[in-house]
């Protein structure tokens, strides 16, 4: 899915209002320095691509994130504010239903959610250049210059 046409500000508002709190709840009792952040993103569409991947794709040692509250709210936000996103997720939803229902918080899952927090932080506050500056690095973000 191409996240270029999402309403980034509405997704940011959803994150700040609810999703962030659910991530904190999931990570409760974990030190912020416990994990090395290895996943990064360069602009807002890229950040959403990485967020989707980490949130919904099962990985070795962490198969259960898609059933967490923050994941369901993330899915809802993307479905509402990204045109056509829901249609692309039908197969993924069916696969998710087949996944085992027990929620096990492994250390690998905690590490993955720590990475997610960093990605969301980056999504919410990309460093946008001043208008008139010639050294823009995030071309995808140019049209979002005034609201980030």
């Amino acid at each position: 899915y191409d996240f270029t046409n999402c309403d980034f500000e509405k997704i940011k508002a959803a994150y700040l209002s609810t999703i962030s709190k659910d991530l904190i709840t999931y990570m409760s009792g974990t030190k912020s320095t416990e994990f090395n952040n290895t996943v990064s993103c360069s602009n807002r569409p890229h950040c959403l691509t990485e967020i989707q991947s980490l949130t919904f794709n099962p990985t070795a040692g962490c198969a259960s994130l898609a059933k967490e509250m923050f994941a369901m709210k993330t899915k809802a936000a993307l479905a509402i504010w990204c045109p056509g996103y829901s249609e692309t997720q039908i197969n993924a939803t069916q696969a998710m239903k087949k996944a085992r229902k027990s929620k096990v918080t492994t250390n690998k899952c905690l590490e993955q959610v720590s990475q997610l927090q960093g990605l969301w932080r980056r999504f919410n506050r990309p460093l946008l250049k001043q208008q008139g500056s010639s050294d823009y690095k995030d071309d995808d973000d140019k049209h979002h210059h005034h609201h980030h």
Epitope: Y15, L16, T33, N37, W120, R122, L127, L128, H146, H148
Partner: antibody, heavy 120, light 111 residues
Framework: QAYLQQSGAELVRPGASVKMSCKAS????????MHWVKHTPGQGLEWIGA????????SYNQKFKDRATLTVDKSSRTAYMQLSSLTSEDSAVYFC?????????????WGAGTTVTVSS | DIVLTQSPASLAVSLGQRATISCRAS??????????MHWYQQKPGQPPRLLLY???NLGSGIPARFSGSGSGTDFTLTLNPVETDDVATYYC?????????FGAGTKLELK
């Protein structure tokens, strides 16, 4: 506990440059925007710019863009600010600050400040 | 650039009374229903300390004597009741539009 340790006071000549440091500990340095803020009794607080340590991307206040250079050394978890072509107007306390956990755009961790005095 | 105008520039309040500081933005700092206006307290020789984020949310460890309100272009910081430890300069800050800007500050003194 998140902490920012800034370098010591500097006395510099007009026209010279100064480079100050801000060493981070207690948090995932590469995933937080790091900012620099100038404080003078007359002017209050002024935002100079910010850097994202993850990839070195920067954003500057146009007022400081030509004279301020922000860099990071990820291995030592240190942010740097160099100010060039100094004048007496640059005499101030310079703070580094970490942007918040969520990307709300507020500063929740501050360094103690580096005092820069420009005098001949 | 968004200009933040704080008023008054200074005020003197008696212990136990209410102090109200205003911050007016030259354009709205709201976005998708959220107000990206923050407040700080700064004492001489110290870095600023976050008081309130997004207009009305208390920062970590900040007592409930501090409160904030407002949206769009008009925001208010209220201290009630004022204590001796509140003598400081207070700044508003917006982040909705680059560049990030601060108000000129309001100096709070005791009567």
């Amino acid at each position: 506990q998140a902490y920012l340790q800034q370098s010591g006071a500097e006395l510099v000549r007009p026209g010279a440059s100064v480079k100050m440091s801000c060493k981070a500990s207690g948090f995932a340095f590469t995933t937080y925007n790091m900012h620099w803020v100038k404080h003078t009794p007359g002017q209050g607080l002024e935002w100079i710019g910010a850097i994202y340590p993850g990839n070195g991307e920067t954003s500057y206040n146009q007022k400081f863009k030509d004279r301020a250079t922000l860099t990071v050394d990820k291995s030592s978890r240190t942010a740097y600010m160099q100010l060039s072509s100094l004048t007496s107007e640059d005499s101030a306390v310079y703070f580094c600050a970490r942007e918040d956990d969520y990307g709300e755009g507020y500063f929740d961790v501050w360094g103690a400040g580096t005092t820069v005095t420009v005098s001949s | 650039d968004i200009v933040l105008t704080q008023s008054p520039a200074s005020l003197a309040v008696s212990l136990g009374q209410r102090a109200t500081i205003s911050c007016r933005a030259s354009e709205s700092v709201d976005n998708s229903g959220l107000s990206f206006m923050h407040w700080y307290q700064q004492k001489p020789g110290q870095p600023p300390r976050l008081l309130l984020y997004r207009a009305s949310n208390l920062g970590s460890g900040i007592p409930a004597r501090f409160s904030g309100s407002g949206s769009g272009t008009d925001f208010t910081l209220t201290l009630n009741p004022v204590e001796t430890d509140d003598v400081a300069t207070y700044y508003c800050q917006q982040i909705n539009t680059d560049p990030l800007t601060f108000g000129a500050g309001t100096k709070l003194e005791l009567k």
